[in-house]
Interface confidence: low
């Protein structure tokens, strides 16, 4: 079974996202992975996209994230663009219109992205073998 190119794109984007920290990668997001035993793969992707959308919607123009230097500003802008791309690709992979995100647990964005990367790499290894 050939791996979906969208999956490869997601992994590539996650690699870029986890390579460099920004002022706001330590901010918290809803941890949808904390209790996802009864969740389908598509629901997980949809909920992950929802969490990312909530994050970039709230913090795209957050002055704390934009920082005081040109480099901090550029890195945050790049983070938001990658999150948007990730959102779209996850949304396309999920194929669902909406999904609830009700978990109380929190995780840093950095840890959330690392966890998502692990899941995506596992999925890729299965479909490429």
């Amino acid at each position: 079974h050939k791996c979906d190119i969208t999956l490869q794109e997601i992994i590539k984007t996650l690699n870029s996202l986890t390579e460099q920290k920004t002022l706001c990668t330590e901010l918290t997001v809803t941890d949808i992975f904390a209790a996802s035993k009864n969740t389908t793969e598509k629901e997980t992707f949809c909920r992950a996209a929802t969490v990312l959308r909530q994050f970039y919607s709230h913090h795209e123009k957050d002055t704390r994230c934009l920082g005081a230097t040109a480099q901090q500003f550029h890195r945050h802008k790049q983070l938001i663009r990658f999150l948007k791309r990730l959102d779209r690709n996850l949304w396309g992979l999920a194929g669902l219109n909406s999904c609830p995100v009700k978990e109380a647990n929190q995780s840093t964005l950095e840890n959330f992205l690392e966890r998502l990367k692990t899941i995506m790499r596992e999925k890729y290894s299965k479909c490429s073998s």
């Epitope: 190119i5 663009r81 959102d87 779209r88 949304w91 396309g92 194929g95």
Partner: antibody, heavy 123, light 106 residues
Framework: QLQLQESGPGLVKPSETLSLTCTVS??????????WGWIRQPPGKGLEWIGS???????DYNPSLKSRVTISVDTSKNQFSLKLSSVTAADTAVYYC???????????????WGQGTMVTVSS | DIQMTQSPSSLSASVGDRVTITCQAS??????LNWYQQKPGKAPKLLIY???NLETGVPSRFSGSGSGTDFTFTISSLQPEDIATYYC????????FGGGTKVEIK
């Protein structure tokens, strides 16, 4: 097959807001994994991407136009719209709506285009 | 913002000639590049996506190559119906079109 049709006034006065609508027929505007964009072309010049709206509802705008642009979708009417505020003569162009994302990636090529509508900014 | 520089801006060639257009990105865009054909008074038409993939229904005389910052679009044997302006477009970060190359028949 899927078709796109732009509509709106052909003449807009300077400092006013340009409003265009793109009606999608032959398919649903909510279809995964497509997205929708606006591109313009001033007379005798090249193509300029204005902005796009995605199934998630998120938007991307050309940084040079971002402060003046709003793109929205009305799924009930199978339409998406462009609003460009504070127009000047430099905004005179043929405005195209287009569908994107029709290949293996979500961010992708604009593969279906409307025929374009000429908008002149003049008093 | 990523800038796309297309060259030449115009060219004139004979029917049957091999025509080559280049597009250079201001930074590495992998293969996130498309090529479009626009005939006078018409909307652009997608010819090549992902730098080298031929869109369904497009004649095989059209081809694309390249990765990173340098890309090439080729018409192996120019036909009268190929008279048009050709544009490259990157989608690595937002979307930017090249300035266009107008192709005419000698």
């Amino acid at each position: 097959q899927l078709q796109l049709q732009e509509s709106g006034p052909g003449l807009v006065k300077p400092s006013e807001t340009l409003s265009l609508t793109c009606t999608v027929s032959g398919g649903s505007i909510s279809s995964i994994p497509y997205y929708w964009g606006w591109i313009r072309q001033p007379p005798g010049k090249g193509l300029e991407w204005i902005g796009s709206i995605y199934p998630s509802g998120s938007t991307d705008y050309n940084p040079s136009l971002k402060s003046r642009v709003t793109i929205s979708v009305d799924t009930s009417k199978n339409q998406f719209s462009l609003k460009l505020s504070s127009v000047t003569a430099a905004d005179t162009a043929v405005y195209y709506c287009a569908r994107g994302g029709a290949r293996d990636r979500i961010d992708h090529a604009f593969d279906i285009w409307g025929q374009g509508t000429m908008v002149t900014v003049s008093s | 913002d990523i800038q796309m520089t297309q060259s030449p801006s115009s060219l004139s060639a004979s029917v049957g000639d091999r025509v080559t257009i280049t597009c250079q990105a201001s930074q590495d865009i992998s293969n996130y590049l498309n090529w479009y054909q626009q005939k006078p008074g018409k909307a652009p038409k997608l010819l090549i996506y992902d730098a080298s993939n031929l869109e369904t229904g497009v004649p095989s005389r059209f081809s694309g190559s390249g990765s990173g910052t340098d890309f090439t679009f080729t018409i192996s044997s120019l036909q009268p119906e190929d008279i048009a302006t050709y544009y490259c477009q990157q989608y690595y970060d937002l979307y930017t079109f090249g300035g266009g190359t107008k192709v005419e028949i000698k």
